[in-house]
């Protein structure tokens, strides 16, 4: 059995996380998409798109904005004004049923720390883009994870684009998809 490899992203308070999830397959184009946070072993849906999705029709829930591009197979997630308590494990999912989601991407381990001054300054409002491509090494999330890969945040005034390496995945096998129960 294979494991989901989490990737660690470090931010300062006040910064913005931008994630682009690449779902590619047409069968997901009209499905609802969601951004979820793992709380213990259980995922919590923080925001989800409407159905059917429409291009450039953002859904905003507090500091989270979801924008689906079904004609291009992309979901854009933005979390603004990050706080220390936002730290945790997040995932893009295809939200198909009330109690089931299809997890197509390795989880993001978000670590938010206080800035040097302790409060976010205007120079810290940078965005780090995270590009997600489907995972072929996936199993239902359990209490243990493989060692995270740390992506060090660049100086606050810069914008960093972090791309998931490797070729796109040919999702021809439904075992490439993890089904995780959703409790909202």
């Amino acid at each position: 059995t294979t494991e989901l490899t989490e990737e660690k992203y470090e931010y300062k308070e006040g910064q913005t996380l931008e994630v682009k999830c690449d779902y590619a397959l047409e069968k997901y184009a009209n499905s609802r998409k969601a951004w979820q946070k793992m709380e213990g072993k259980m995922p919590k849906i923080l925001a989800k798109t409407e159905r059917p999705s429409e291009n450039s029709h953002p859904v905003q829930v507090g500091r989270i904005t979801l924008e689906d591009y079904p004609d291009h197979g992309l979901l854009q997630v933005q979390m603004t004004n990050l706080q220390v308590e936002d730290s945790g494990l997040y995932q893009c999912v295809i939200y198909q049923h009330p109690k089931e989601s299809h997890v197509l991407f390795n989880p993001i381990c978000l670590v938010v720390t206080k800035g040097s001054s302790g409060t976010p300054g205007s120079s810290e409002n940078s965005t780090q883009n995270v590009y997600r491509t489907p995972s072929t090494t996936a199993k239902a999330l359990g209490p243990r994870y493989t060692s995270p890969r740390t992506v060090t945040q660049a100086p606050p005034e810069s914008t960093v684009v972090v791309s998931t390496p490797g070729s796109e995945i040919n999702l021809t096998n439904v075992t490439d998809i993890i089904r995780v129960p959703v409790f909202n």
């Epitope: 682009k20 690449d22 779902y23 590619a24 397959l25 047409e26 069968k27 184009a29 009209n30 924008e67 591009y69 079904p70 004609d71 291009h72 197979g73 992309l74 854009q76 883009n129 684009v161 796109e168 040919n170 999702l171 021809t172 096998n173």
Partner: antibody
Framework: EVQLVESGGGLVQPGGSLKLSCAAS????????MHWVRQASGKGLEWVGR??????????YYAASVKGRFTISRDDSKNTAYLQMNSLKTEDTAVYYC????????????WGQGTLVTVSS | DIVLTQSPDSLAVSLGERATINCRAS??????????LHWYQQKPGQPPKLLIY???NLESGVPDRFSGSGSGTDFTLTISSLQAEDVAVYYC?????????FGQGTKLEIK
């Protein structure tokens, strides 16, 4: 291993019709859009059109040069895509390739070897 | 329609030297910061082969001397050290908008 095999090419007179087939194997055919691309001898590549999947209602899109004359269809039960060419013109003479993308608006990762269509009197 | 214009039309480069091919789009091929611009290599009598997808991603099995860059309307394919087997015609292609379109091709030869 993904394989795409075109067939049905040949010699046809101007104004005539021809139907090309693309037999696919090695992947879940119904999951992916299928495209046709052509290439006249010594010339560049020209995208002909595409057909999407059932979840996209088998929507089709065409290049302006073939719209109204060519029709793309698919039979998921036979893992086959088709290109019906009507009102053929001499300028339609080309090698016709069947291609498969990697998902919505993604790149053409897989190509057939092509089949030659010659329109001549 | 999006028109892709490649330059130069033909290129002669010495073995081991760098080869650069440009592709300019008549309008942006980007959506959500993704560039839907791809590069293919075609040798005589063969179907095209994917080299680079979405502007800068190297297709699996393609030598890392090939690289792609650019966004919006301007893109570049670079071969860092030309090898004899790289002699071919190279095409850029956009899939951001229907109809999909190809550049006219660039013929790469050995000097």
């Amino acid at each position: 291993e993904v394989q795409l095999v075109e067939s049905g090419g040949g010699l046809v007179q101007p104004g005539g019709s021809l139907k090309l087939s693309c037999a696919a194997s090695g992947f879940t055919f119904s999951t992916y859009a299928m495209h046709w691309v052509r290439q006249a001898s010594g010339k560049g590549l020209e995208w002909v059109g595409r057909i999407r999947t059932k979840s996209s209602n088998y929507a089709t899109y065409y290049a302006a040069s073939v719209k109204g004359r060519f029709t793309i269809s698919r039979d998921d039960s036979k893992n086959t895509a088709y290109l019906q060419m009507n009102s053929l013109k001499t300028e339609d003479t080309a090698v016709y390739y069947c291609t498969r993308d990697m998902g919505i608006r993604r790149q053409f990762a897989y190509w057939g070897q092509g089949t030659l269509v010659t329109v001549s009197s | 329609d999006i028109v892709l214009t490649q330059s130069p039309d033909s290129l002669a480069v010495s073995l081991g030297e760098r080869a650069t091919i440009n592709c300019r789009a008549s309008q942006s091929v980007d959506t959500a910061d993704y560039s839907f611009l791809h590069w293919y290599q075609q040798k005589p009598g063969q179907p095209p082969k994917l080299l680079i997808y979405r502007a800068s991603n190297l297709e699996s099995g393609v030598p890392d001397r090939f690289s792609g860059s650019g966004s919006g309307t301007d893109f570049t394919l670079t071969i860092s050290s030309l090898q004899a087997e790289d002699v071919a015609v190279y095409y850029c292609q956009q899939s951001n908008q229907d109809p999909y379109t190809f550049g006219q091709g660039t013929k790469l030869e050995i000097k």
